[in-house]
């Protein structure tokens, strides 16, 4: 017999053929024998199975002696063996309708897991395979489970039914609910204004939420938050602001945050956690204040930095156009009477400068001057 | 190690007064908000005060309007609760706490002071 | 006012058992939410703030979930030190309000 595969809420067509190419009587029925519709004449007629509302022909297919039944929004209990009755002969088809929902939501928090269930008639042993819009397959019976979604699993998931050899395809929509970044690295001179940004890697239409930032400063011995906030259909109002260092926040999407100064005592590392209406857990973002200060105090000049730096990064300190005097991998640098002119400190990452102080040092009859 | 402690509880007549102290230590004090919560007998906690970094932002529960006033000194690194005009139902265990968990929590809590209006 | 309503307001329950009390706000209130730990003649103990975040030196049995007027404590495998009362608190508007409570008692 024919095996024909069909998709919750899909519609299907079983064909029948006679050898007439003519409108001849014709009957559909279900594995018990229940008549589904058939023909008297010109005329399509029900009868008394569960199918009565969603079943129908293609009447302009008679005159070719094609009897197809169309069964439309497929049930799994659809499932059956449906027989066609013409000219004396009987022509069955195997229906196996299959379904395959996501576990909850398919909009997920970047870190949760996602579970794709399929609905499957009694009887059958169907395999599936699914392959996620970064090309990574997975493979499972009635249920597939991902753990630890990432962002470039959001998009589209295709999954393949397959059942006595034949496949039905199934596509998923999946949005992964994450900050574009998981980390960012600011940095600044002192004194300088600072700029966090945490754009979101997704679009929703209505946004409500809340949030905080908690600030760990390198010179602290304790961590705590710096802003709470409130998100009200992709508006921001602060809740309460810490009073130093007293932060602004922009008003709009994306969050924004001003730190008016970079100061010493502000830098180290931060974790921006947004809750989001109707999720349970939180999306997070690190982002991390490196500030530099170049200072002149009597025959002695230093620059320093604070803040989360790696072990690789360079600190040096160099008279402008010539080569460095000092150059270390510390946090701390400096040189015993400098002579006089434009010195610069410069913090780099193999070569590449990414942040630098400049600090005019007079001759030594003078006290300096910061450009 | 983060320390409130609280003193000043006894026992004191209807429409009387009381100031409740909150001692802290362990911590920069003048960095954090700061609330008091009560326990009358057998019951359960009810938010009473809080005040921010530098007592020029309070909140008061409407029960307690004009007649408790929260209030602190940052050089003595201490909170107080300012109790007038008291009545029975203010009978209860006092507790300073820091507002100092993520998500606005109350992260750590003296050990109470015990409160008695009667006659 | 914010009304914090919890349930149930008491549970017997043995070493080892699942616990979850649930505490429902009168209005949405995101994840501006906490849980406490009191037990007799102490002070209430950090458990959950943020609704899900786990305070710090917290045993991981104790777990939070939920968001807007729906929340959940809950304890995975209830150990003898457990047994005490817990309470839920909303911070999203002022005055903050607390739950009535939920006794944890031994079976």
């Known amino acids: 017999k024919k095996v024909v595969l069909g998709k919750k809420g899909d519609t299907v067509e079983l064909t029948c053929t006679a050898s007439q190419k003519k409108s001849i009587q014709f009957h559909w029925k279900n594995s018990n024998q229940i008549k589904i519709l058939g023909n008297q004449g010109s005329f399509l007629t029900k009868g008394p199975s569960k199918l009565n509302d969603r079943a129908d022909s293609r009447r302009s297919l008679w005159d070719q002696g094609n009897f197809p039944l169309i069964i439309k929004n497929l049930k799994i209990e659809d499932s059956d063996t449906y027989i066609c009755e013409v000219e004396d002969q009987k022509e069955e088809v195997q229906l196996l309708v299959f379904g395959l929902t996501a576990n909850s939501d398919t909009h997920l928090l970047q870190g949760q897991s996602l579970t794709l269930t399929l609905e499957s008639p009694p009887g059958s042993s169907p395999s599936v395979q699914c392959r996620s819009p970064r090309g990574k397959n997975i493979q499972g019976g009635k249920t597939l489970s991902v753990s630890q979604l990432e962002l470039q699993d959001s998009g589209t998931w295709t999954c393949t039914v397959l059942q006595n050899q034949k496949k039905v395809e199934f596509k998923i929509d999946i949005v992964v609910l994450a900050f574009q970044k998981a980390s960012s690295i600011v940095y600044k001179k002192e004194g300088e204004q600072v700029e966090f940004s945490f754009p979101l890697a997704f679009t929703v239409e209505k946004l409500t939420g809340s949030g905080e930032l908690w600030w760990q400063a390198e010179r602290a011995s304790s961590s705590k938050s710096w802003i709470t906030f409130d998100l009200k259909n992709k508006e921001v109002s602060v809740k309460r602001v810490t009073q130093d260092p007293k932060l602004q926040m922009g008003k709009k999407l994306p969050l924004h945050l001003t730190l008016p100064q970079a100061l010493p005592q502000y830098a180290g590392s931060g974790n921006l956690t947004l809750a989001l209406e109707a999720k349970t857990g939180k999306l997070h973002q690190e982002v991390n204040l490196v500030v530099m200060r170049a200072t002149q105090l009597q025959k002695n000049l230093t620059c320093e930095v604070w803040g989360p730096t790696s072990p690789k990064l360079m600190l040096s300190l160099k008279l402008e156009n010539k080569e460095a005097k000092v150059s270390k991998r510390e946090k701390a640098v400096w040189v015993l009477n400098p002579e006089a002119g434009m010195w610069q400190c410069l913090l780099s990452d193999s070569g590449q400068v990414l942040l630098e102080s400049n600090i005019k040092v007079l001759p030594t009859w003078s006290t300096p001057v910061q450009p | 190690e983060v320390q409130l402690v609280e003193s000043g509880g006894g026992l004191v007549q209807p429409g009387g007064s009381l100031r409740l102290s909150c001692a802290a230590s362990?911590?920069?004090?003048?960095?954090?908000?700061m609330s008091w919560v009560r326990q009358a007998p057998g019951q359960g906690l009810e938010w009473v005060a809080n005040?921010?970094?530098?007592?020029?932002?309070?909140y008061h529960v409407d029960s307690v309007k004009g007649r408790l006033t929260i209030s602190r000194d940052n050089a003595k690194n201490s909170l107080y609760l300012q109790m007038n005009s008291l009545r029975g139902v203010d009978t209860a265990v006092y507790f300073c706490?820091?507002?100092?968990?993520?998500?606005?929590?109350?992260?750590?809590w003296g050990q109470g002071a015990l409160v008695t209006v009667s006659s | 006012d914010i009304q914090m309503t919890q349930s149930p307001s008491s549970v017997s329950a043995s070493v080892g058992d699942r616990v979850s009390i649930t505490c429902r706000a009168s209005?949405?209130?995101?994840?501006?939410l906490a849980w406490y730990q009191q037990k007799p003649g102490k002070a209430p103990k950090l458990l959950i703030y943020?609704?899900?975040g786990l305070q710090s030196g917290v045993p991981s049995r104790f777990s939070g979930s939920g968001s807007g007027t729906d929340f959940t404590l809950t304890i995975s495998s209830l150990q003898p030190e457990d047994f005490a009362t817990y309470y839920c608190?909303?911070?999203?508007?002022?005055?903050?309000?607390f739950g009535q409570g939920t006794k944890v008692e031994i079976k």
């Open positions: 608190q909303q911070a999203n508007s002022f005055p903050w309000t």
């Open positions: 706490a820091r507002e100092g968990g993520q998500w606005l929590a109350l992260d750590y």
């Open positions: 362990g911590f920069t004090f003048s960095s954090y908000w």
């Open positions: 209005q949405g209130i995101s994840s501006w």
């Open positions: 005040i921010n970094e530098d007592g020029n932002e309070k």
């Open positions: 943020g609704a899900s």
